[in-house]
Amino acid sequence: TPEVWVQVQMEATELSSFTVHCGFLGPGSISLVTVSWGGPDGAGGTKLAVLHPELGTRQWAPARQARWETQSSISLALEDSGASSPFANTTFCCKFASFPEGSWESCGSLPPSSDPGLSAPPTPVPILRAD
């Protein structure tokens, strides 16, 4: 069964910078990746970035850079402009659309006890839905 994993990482050098890493574990080719925050895409979450293997990427503040890391994983750099750190309590969700499997989505957040520079373990957390 295909699975999606999500890591949220605080940068050690800049405490206002976060990176979301997402990956797809399964067969099939990725046709689209959507990263949202505040909840799943289409269920109360706001799109932060959309990555297409051919059409390119679109991103919106506070996302700074979205890029492919491998053919089945992406990273999204975020810049926290606020004085406090709202990202620390925010849920980030990644949805991978794969042909012919369908869509798979998982969510994650920064671990409460995580030190700067340390990320959540890349444990697959297959939640929500498979369209």
């Epitope: 046709s31 109360g44 297409h52 659309a97």
Partner: nanobody
Amino acid sequence: HVQLVESGGGLVQPGGSLRLSCVASASGFTYRPYCMAWFRQAPGKEREAVAGIDIFGGTTYADSVKGRFTASRDNAGFSLYLQMNSLRAEDTAVYYCAAGDSPDGRCPPLGQGLNYWGQGTMVTVSS
């Protein structure tokens, strides 16, 4: 709940121009649809697709408006525009904004898979 609100309709003379706008809003979050599109329905006729634009900026147009109408989206991703030039009497219709998501981020064949619709704005082309 997602709401689409159109504006910019009105009365214009043949050969004139109009710019329609549509804003997608949602309660509690920012809705950035993969696809936003314009449709129109003339009196006594079926609704027809006019133009669509995906989240990456790719556009599709009905043959009847190619070269005259231009669809665009704002950088924030939730507003849609339609610049209509060289308007003709046959462009008279209620213009509807529609939005929805698709498996690959592109607009589906116009008229399919768009699950949110606005109330429409009237465009009348007459001398």
